[in-house]
Amino acid sequence: KSSNEATNITPKHNMKAFLDELKAENIKKFLYNFTQIPHLAGTEQNFQLAKQIQSQWKEFGLDSVELAHYDVLLSYPNKTHPNYISIINEDGNEIFNTSLFEPPPPGYENVSDIVPPFSAFSPQGMPEGDLVYVNYARTEDFFKLERDMKINCSGKIVIARYGKVFRGNKVKNAQLAGAKGVILYSDPADYFAPGVKSYPDGWNLPGGGVQRGNILNLNGAGDPLTPGYPANEYAYRRGIAEAVGLPSIPVHPIGYYDAQKLLEKMGGSAPPDSSWRGSLKVPYNVGPGFTGNFSTQKVKMHIHSTNEVTRIYNVIGTLRGAVEPDRYVILGGHRDSWVFGGIDPQSGAAVVHEIVRSFGTLKKEGWRPRRTILFASWDAEEFGLLGSTEWAEENSRLLQERGVAYINADSSIEGNYTLRVDCTPLMYSLVHNLTKELKSPDEGFEGKSLYESWTKKSPSPEFSGMPRISKLGSGNDFEVFFQRLGIASGRARYTKNWETNKFSGYPLYHSVYETYELVEKFYDPMFKYHLTVAQVRGGMVFELANSIVLPFDCRDYAVVLRKYADKIYSISMKHPQEMKTYSVSFDSLFSAVKNFTEIASKFSERLQDFDKSNPIVLRMMNDQLMFLERAFIDPLGLPDRPFYRHVIYAPSSHNKYAGESFPGIYDALFDIESKVDPSKAWGEVKRQIYVAAFTVQAAAETLSEVA
């Protein structure tokens, strides 16, 4: 199934021509252009950038480029009433205040409109009280505090270190524990690679650097005021009290210099074990409250941010397909940034820009893809994936009928060690085949394929000689396409060495120091890793849009379904007595997986043999492939998460960033030993096994011969 067989094809208009047209120097130039001023969602600067991108995509040769606007709930600090945290003495006097802004990086001292660090969507409030250190504020951290250490967070202000899980989950956990405020901070243990200098001398986080970010728990809802529907001109908006996912307690982020001042005075219980200690020179006592000499001092938060309905703008570009214009392959990444966006998102947006330019060059020479390619520059991703979700809500009927694949294009790099791919199993073979054709940019792998360096540096834990490909979680714009609509999705970027760098994300994530210079000086001076990511993302889009038979292998889904069934069964088998008592059986699920495996195998055989010159049969087979991902969607959604509808994958209920397999069963089993009504709890497990087994069987049947 060569890509050379598209309409109006000339031999030079193939994948190679597309890839050869991609240039590192252009990506560098585009990155510079996109990072000179902040492009915060809802601001005039970001609207201007949207119009610039619209204009340039038109120049590049796309058939049409439109702006799609929505009026969504955003959050901003109060410009005249800044947010901060104090230590107050017994008289209520503020004896220490956290900083109001990050010291600007060299060369950016005179830039206006740098939003100070804040937790987007924090409610207003000025709570004061004793501090409790809650480690990463994960579910297991609160279990340790409440169950083992008998520490009650009710009425306390908790301080949690960033990392390990999505910040929104931390806030949700703190709320459930009864906290009245949350302070988030970046510990050097997680955001400072030992031995590397801090910015501007290296890529580490300085003590005054702070991670911004939203703290929502949207569970895929999009705009908090219009869940399920687009936030358009005639939208009905919920009242703020009914808005989806808003936190109920004040939250604020700080850097490690300020965190040191709060943590050094902590008293109460010692940390339960070394995993609760970061790298600061403080005891990491849990509290509650300060130690002896300082026991009368309290912590007070001053949060004055406001939630405002604000207009956002997506840019949607179309390159019409020549043969199947009603089949859409989408390449999308966001444009809005917290400040300069040197990595997040502009390292991705610059790559998208160059991919559009390359496709446009081919189109100007008379070529068209077989299927339509849609390019998207999403707005307000940082505020909860709002731009992509609203657009998908507005176009859901078209997308569920016509959506072939979605390739995400946020940050192109989070390191410069090796490739990282998360995708649907349907794309495994596409990714393997593509990376075997691309050159590795890695030192020591000159003349070797990307597949080879990737496999060597990031081997699959299950299959020798193959690279690791991870499950899709969330926290990015593929969410609505994959988790809600069931459109096959994937993402790729260059990453760090997770073995040696255990910090979370990259150190300067969402700080003012995420600049063009950070990338150009420290991460990718030659822009060779950006170019490789452009080749991977662009190559995937090219193949998905152009190959005669869709490059999906349903047999790979069969393999992972068996793996996931084994995994969830082994979790359940930690409770053998209860499984016996409540007659819990996984037979139906294993049977469905077996059927899926057999039917997928037969489908793959038919796929090799059918008459590709028969357009009706070709379309039929491709539709079965396209709709396979859709078949894993349960229209009722997961319990209490109606917009997470994929039965095989969902974002973890404990960490939005991570993907969980058979999430319905997993959540039903989670902490089941603590449930007050075990009969009801195990009944829910049985129901979730039923839903999963039915869904896998139903999906298998979509691959059966149609008649």
């Epitope: 050097p188 400072f192 030992p194 031995g195 200098k197 801090s198 001398d201 580490n204 300085p206 003590g207 490690y256 210099y257 200690r277 790298s279 600061l280 020179k281 005891p283």
Partner: antibody, heavy 124, light 107 residues
Framework: QVQLVQSGGGLVQPGGSLRLSCAAS????????MSWVRQAPGKGLEWVAN????????YYVDSVKGRFTISRDNAKNSLYLQMNSLRAEDTAVYYC?????????????????WGQGTMVTVSS | AIRMTQSPSTLSASVGDRVTITCRAS??????LAWYQQKPGKAPELLIY???SLQSGVPSRFSGSGSGTDFTLTINSLQPEDFATYYC?????????FGPGTKVDIK
């Protein structure tokens, strides 16, 4: 190569003043905290003072507070110790040292580069 | 201020010996401890930081261990160039403080 070259020691009377200098080369001076450490004749090492990269934070051992001032000139890659109201017990070899903040931007994890030392004798 | 003590104050050993020096802090300093070697008339040299991490260029016969209040410097097979005075230093809190030193001399 990375080095610290000291100057400015000597003999001074009690109550007198002296200014020590330390010239850095071979590394980005403005990226490091710097320190002064002293060693009285035949005795052990004693940390004297620390200064942050941009000079915005300074710390001193109690025995020199109010008498000694640590400063730096990043344009000249130089560190200074202004010593006033000198006492006999300040007699020592004074070392300038680079602070190594291996684990994070802090007042330091260790002293990884040292000057050759300069002798300060306070005697009448 | 945190008080640092070292033992022994003097240690006589032969080439090839395994030598152990201990350092104790008056309060918990976690892992924030460094070890230095100083030869007569010379500036100290950093051997170990963060209790157990070997400074670049330092021979692997030197090793450090411990956390909290008790720490150890071990020289696995003493070489002629290792006869010197060794100091521990805490960097947990200002004022930074050194131990009084351990002199390793030839038996």
């Amino acid at each position: 190569q990375v080095q610290l070259v000291q100057s400015g020691g000597g003999l001074v009377q009690p109550g007198g003043s002296l200014r020590l200098s330390c010239a850095a080369s071979g590394f980005t001076f403005s990226s490091y905290w710097m320190s002064w450490v002293r060693q009285a004749p035949g005795k052990g090492l004693e940390w004297v003072a620390n200064i942050k990269q941009d000079g915005s934070e300074k710390y001193y051992v109690d025995s020199v507070k109010g008498r000694f001032t640590i400063s730096r000139d990043n344009a000249k890659n130089s560190l200074y110790l202004q010593m006033n109201s000198l006492r006999a017990e300040d007699t020592a070899v004074y070392y300038c040292a680079r602070v190594w903040d291996y684990y994070y931007d802090s007042s330091g994890d260790a002293f990884d580069i040292w000057g050759q030392g300069t002798m300060v004798t306070v005697s009448s | 201020a945190i008080r640092m003590t070292q033992s022994p104050s003097t240690l006589s050993a032969s080439v090839g010996d395994r030598v152990t020096i201990t350092c104790r802090a008056s309060q918990n300093i976690y892992g924030w401890l460094a070890w230095y070697q100083q030869k007569p008339g010379k500036a100290p040299e950093l051997l170990i930081y963060a209790a157990s991490s070997l400074q670049s260029g330092v021979p692997s016969r030197f090793s450090g261990s411990g956390s909290g209040t008790d720490f150890t410097l071990t020289i696995n097979s003493l070489q002629p160039e290792d006869f010197a005075t060794y100091y521990c230093q805490q960097s947990y809190t200002i004022p930074f403080t050194f131990g009084p030193g351990t002199k390793v001399d030839i038996k």
